[in-house]
Interface confidence: low
Amino acid sequence: QNCSGPCRCPDEPAPRCPAGVSLVLDGCGCCRVCAKQLGELCTERDPCDPHKGLFCHFGSPANRKIGVCTAKDGAPCIFGGTVYRSGESFQSSCKYQCTCLDGAVGCMPLCSMDVRLPSPDCPFPRRVKLPGKCCEEWVCDEPKDQTVVGPALAAYRLEDTFGPDPTMIRANCLVQTTEWSACSKTCGMGISTRVTNDNASCRLEKQSRLCMVRPCEADLEENIKKGKKCIRTPKISKPIKFELSGCTSMKTYRAKFCGVCTDGRCCTPHRTTTLPVEFKCPDGEVMKKNMMFIKTCACHYNCPGDNDIFESLYYRKMYGDMA
């Protein structure tokens, strides 16, 4: 974690790193380790790949224990086999408008990304690709039982997933903020990022937050009651403390996590918020990190398709975030 004691390295030879990953000395100049890659968590002991122009971005100097591997200012992006300059905007497909910033790509959906929840008169909503149209549209499969359960006051229940218009004009600045990317881990602590120019200088900057979609140890499928198809938003039974590279959150949290869907649908965060979490490290230092907290999850058929480069990389975005 830090550089205050003698080296404790595994015996040489050095570890074997995956193809394209550099073998470097850790930040203490002590042990040989496989370099962390773009967007991964990094520490003094787990440095980023210098041969790819990455550095560990820690945010404010007071929070210098754990950072995110970030490309140096002006680094280009490689996206779908094409190189884009830092600051360049491009349309990755008819569905997404993207911006390259210092090696990272942030994209905004051009299609509505709402989640349509089942309702009595539309129990099996599906998104389908219609001929000649870019954006998928919702269709309702006919229910097997035509009997309507309860009064159909509305055709369907549609959760409004967007807050205010993400494009705003403020003091000669066209404010644009991409959606938060999907959490980099499907379980355990990961990273979610976005690109925004919502700052005093109207300059594009990358923001990151910690995220945990679900704990890795939770066996959620076993908890699904017979006849049910998913646990959408299980609340953890007891308050927990988050752990991050040996540091522990100072407060306990009764957090919500996303469950599982046994019917082949994806279960991902639907509404989230971002809150600061303080972590205390073994050497007594305290660091503050922004973290995603889940408000609701959704089971849906809108799973990533391998033929869509954007969706396969960023398979599901976080919407309705309040910060």
């Epitope: 003698p6 080296c7 404790r8 203490c28 003094e44 210098p50």
Partner: antibody, heavy 115, light 105 residues
């Protein structure tokens, strides 16, 4: 108390190879990096390179082509070889034990390169 | 990677003196400080930005944020007259500042 004792030839001709050795007394040899640092007359410090117990090395890119740092764990010693010496290599050469920072330093060896 | 220090600073006995060390995003790295008296080997006085090795007096303290690390000597004594070097790691290489000569008037 950790002690580092260093020795080696102090006067060299241009193109010759510098050989210095540093021995550790009263300390553990296995858990640290063992470094060489030099200081030209009236100037600042320059890190040369280092070795760990397994022989893993790390060198200053500006000197890498000329430097070899090696270790002899059986004797608790490590050595520096710097090839193709020139007048610009005239300096006091220090050995040091390092973990993150250079915690303990040898007494220094004055090396002069002159024809 | 370059670490920049002022060549010299002066201080009266008992006063406080601060030495700065500047480098690109230095606050994202750990800074160390070394004291070197004339004709002697350097001594580590601060490591990991703020920490003092055993045997180093409490009057030595360090900080590091943004692009600048600072070594502060409070209640300076005549024996503190020496050259002081900052040091940090970048891309697997150790870098030293050019040194600051502290003169106790």
């Amino acid at each position: 108390q950790v002690q580092l004792q260093q020795w080696g030839a102090g006067l060299l001709k241009p193109s010759e190879t510098l050989s210095l050795t540093c021995a550790l007394y009263d300390g553990s040899f296995s858990d640290y990096y063992w470094s060489w640092i030099r200081q030209p007359p009236g100037k600042g410090l320059e890190w040369i390179g280092e070795v760990n117990r397994s022989g893993g090395t790390n060198y200053n890119p500006s000197l890498k082509s000329r430097v070899t740092v090696s270790v002899d764990t059986s004797k608790n010693q490590f050595s520096l070889k710097l090839r193709s010496m020139t007048a610009a290599d005239t300096a006091v050469y220090y050995c040091a034990r390092r973990y993150g920072s250079f915690e303990y330093w040898g007494q220094g060896t004055t090396v002069t390169v002159s024809s | 990677y370059v670490l920049t220090q002022p060549p010299s600073v002066s201080v009266s006995p008992g006063q406080t003196v601060s030495i700065t060390c500047s480098g690109d995003k230095l606050g994202n790295k750990y800074a160390s400080w070394y004291q070197q008296r004339p004709g002697q080997s350097p001594i580590l006085v601060i490591y990991q930005d703020t920490k003092r090795p055993s045997g180093i007096p409490e009057r030595f303290s360090g900080s590091n944020s943004g692009n600048t690390a600072t070594l502060t000597i409070s209640g300076t004594q005549a024996m503190d007259e020496a050259d002081y070097y900052c040091q940090a790691w970048d891309s697997n290489t150790a870098f030293f500042g050019a040194g600051t000569k502290v003169t106790v008037l």
